[in-house]
């Protein structure tokens, strides 16, 4: 008789990244009695929901339901009917929906309450859906990357199994950029974190881990571009906006009401004279640079340093792993090669800004015009950010490493969010035989 | 606006192969998944398949599996659908068309103008 | 797979005159999707989710349902609303279809 193979004692678990400019859901799986082990967990499937954000539809809440569709349909056909039930499903909404909550609590909670009952109509194990705080997006993207990286084992190897694996348990900060926050966590060395709202401690794994972290709301790419046009459209003359971070002859009307839209656009608000104005580019990576500068308060620090806007930053240590939109961005730019200098990076970007707007249509014919135009804010946004708001340098640019995957699994938050919400970060070093869950972060 | 082009008829033999395409543009191609949609002379619409553009995944009625394939070149915004073994029955208008949320969460829906393939001998 | 049956399979009906069209799914569905089609021409989406008019559609046309059963009316018909409707569902794999109503003139 032949051997039949054993069922996988496998387990899953989804987690639903709500962004601010779209939702991808995560499909998790992992071995049943290795819950406690470390790098056990990997992704099977990303989905990404077809659409905009959530927020984006505070007008029309009964329409979410259709809006997740497709991608609850593919979880359902990725995992195996008889795990169904016990298949844990988290949805996670990040700054677009903190912007949201600013502006009216009560929307939000509109918005999340549908968002709940949809997801209940699946056969799954619905934990629910909240908005998670900047911090917490901040700690579960570091955990993540670290996790994935197998910076939590405490079995040295003389071999390297994963990319960027430097041999030392020394863990990597996390960079993440979002479309309205942008994150920054790391731990720094033998330095007192001077702000509590930006210190994390952990327990994992039997060691011990004092964090920095920061969420700057209002700091990702497309929040910092609204930010930008507000703030540049109060000293232009007329309703033209000569605008250094967009493409020579590319032209784009703007509604005054859209730009005014944002919480993130409040403090550049101004009555106009005008009901929209029109951007033209000029395509000057310098000029660029210099005008998102001006997004960045550097003239009061309370504290031995700052990043910018008075938050506390201490002095950078280790390799950083920038993913998220850092990673699609400069993906896009073909700059994310370990051996591009940062000087490399700067000329390059000087040289994409400066190409005609019609030359960059034609290149890239398959890409939509809005997200093509935004490249060269966005890359000159990331320099920016890094160099002079969280103060990498020439030679520290090198410890930075745009990571899309890490072993198969994308990097950002939802791993770590899932991997402590289903108990699977054991505080203590775990026996060979598992222990009961006793303390987790 | 979002434009879906596909290629000219097809008269094709019983038992032989055909590959018709949908050209895409005014959207980023990943965006969102191409559909296949057929009908038979007089007859109603049936779901043949989808791509999803981001992903490579596809998903097919069980009825084509196997004897339709869906693929995409996205250096060329192009989606194909490849038909084998070709029988009379499979005459039809066949028709790529995309479905969802733009960026200010209004639904659309849009389709190609159709390609006849016509199976005769 | 879901099953969607429309009833009728056609019928006339003279301008002016009010009209309805139903669609009984095998299993329940989230929402329900109406496409107008013409000889010759693409399917038009009219109405979706099941009660939404898509975009260009006049408001005589209205939408409802829930569960298994979803209806699409027209209040007062037009000579341009002579056409085939199909419904569809798009809430689980495989996508599937009515097999239309045709609305006649009388």
């Known amino acids: 008789t032949q051997n039949k193979a054993l069922p996988e004692n496998v387990k899953y678990g989804i987690v639903l990244d709500a962004g601010s400019s779209h939702t991808s859901l995560y499909i998790y799986k992992w071995p049943a009695e290795k819950e406690n082990d470390t790098g056990v967990v990997h992704q099977v499937e990303e989905c990404r929901v077809k659409g905009p954000g959530i927020s984006k539809f505070v007008q029309k809440v009964n329409e979410i339901g259709i809006y997740l569709t497709d991608c609850m349909e593919r979880a359902r056909e990725v995992i195996p009917r008889s795990q169904h039930q016990e298949t844990p499903v988290y949805l996670g909404a990040t700054a677009g929906m903190r912007l949201l909550r600013m502006e009216s609590e009560e929307l939000a909670d509109r918005v999340l309450d549908v968002v709940e009952r949809s997801l209940s109509n699946y056969p799954f194990d619905f934990q629910g859906a909240r908005i998670i705080t900047g911090q917490e997006e901040g700690a579960y993207g570091w955990i993540t990357i670290n996790y994935l990286l197998g910076k939590f084992s405490q079995k040295t190897r003389w071999f390297s199994i994963v990319p960027y694996e430097t041999n030392n348990q020394e863990t990597f900060g996390a960079l993440d950029l979002g479309g309205a926050s942008t994150q920054v966590t790391f731990v720094p060395q033998n330095q007192t974190i001077e702000s509590p709202d930006n210190a994390l401690q952990f327990r994992l794994y039997g060691k011990d881990y004092n964090v920095y972290t920061h969420s700057f709301l209002c700091y990702g790419k497309d929040q910092a571009l609204w930010q930008k046009l507000a703030k540049d459209i109060q000293v232009a003359s007329n309703e033209i906006l000569r605008d250094p971070c967009f493409h020579p002859g590319y032209k784009k009307v703007v509604n005054v009401s859209d730009l005014y839209k944002t919480p993130c656009t409040k403090r550049f608000e101004m009555t106009l004279p005008f009901q929209q104005f029109e951007i033209q580019g000029i395509g000057n990576y310098q000029q660029c640079h210099q005008s998102i500068l001006e997004l960045f308060n550097t003239s009061y620090c309370p504290y031995s340093q700052c990043a910018f806007n008075g938050i506390f930053l201490p002095p950078l240590q280790g390799d950083f792993g920038a993913f998220s939109a850092f990673y699609f961005v400069m993906k896009f730019l073909n700059l994310t090669s370990e051996k591009v200098s940062q000087e490399k990076v700067t000329e390059m970007m000087k040289k994409f800004c400066a190409q005609p707007w019609e030359e960059i249509k034609t290149s890239y014919a398959g890409v939509k015009e809005k997200y093509l135009s935004e490249y060269c804010f966005s890359g000159t946004y990331i320099l920016s950010l890094l160099l002079q708001g969280y103060h990498f340098t020439a030679d520290s640019w090198e410890h930075i490493h745009f990571i899309g995957k890490i072993q198969g699994s994308d990097a950002g938050w939802t791993l770590g969010y899932m991997l402590n919400l289903t108990n699977m970060i054991p505080a203590e070093q775990p026996l060979s035989t598992p222990l009961s869950h006793s303390t987790y972060v | 606006e979002v434009q879906l082009v596909q290629s000219g008829g097809e008269l094709v033999k019983p038992g032989a192969s055909v590959k018709i395409s949908c050209k895409v543009s005014g959207y980023s191609f990943t965006d969102y998944n191409l559909n296949w949609v057929r009908q038979a002379p007089g007859k109603g619409l049936e779901w043949v398949g989808n791509?999803?553009?981001?992903?490579?995944?596809?998903r097919y009625n069980q009825k084509f599996k196997g004897r339709f394939t869906i693929t995409i070149d996205q250096s060329k915004n192009t989606a194909y659908m490849q038909l084998n073994s070709l029988r009379s029955e499979d005459t039809a208008v066949y028709y790529c068309?995309?479905?969802?949320?733009?960026?200010?969460?209004?639904?659309?829906?849009?389709w190609g103008q159709g390609t006849l393939v016509t199976v005769s001998s | 797979e879901i099953v969607l049956t429309q009833s009728p399979a056609s019928l006339s009906a003279s301008p002016g005159e009010r009209v309805t069209i139903s669609c009984s799914a095998s299993?329940?569905?989230?929402?329900m999707h109406w496409f107008q089609q013409k000889p010759g021409q693409a399917p038009k989406l009219w109405i979706y989710?099941?009660?939404n008019l898509a975009s260009g559609v006049p408001a005589r046309f209205s939408g409802s349902g829930s569960g298994t059963d979803y209806t699409l009316t027209i209040s007062s018909m037009e000579p341009e609303d002579f056409a085939t409707y199909y419904c569809?569902?798009?809430?689980?794999?495989?996508?599937?279809f009515g097999q239309g109503t045709k609305v006649e003139i009388k």
């Open positions: 989710a099941t009660s």
């Open positions: 791509i999803d553009p981001y992903s490579g995944g596809t």
């Open positions: 299993s329940s569905v989230s929402y």
């Open positions: 068309g995309l479905y969802g949320y733009d960026d200010d969460a209004n639904y659309f829906d849009d």
């Open positions: 569809q569902q798009r809430s689980s794999y495989p996508l599937t």
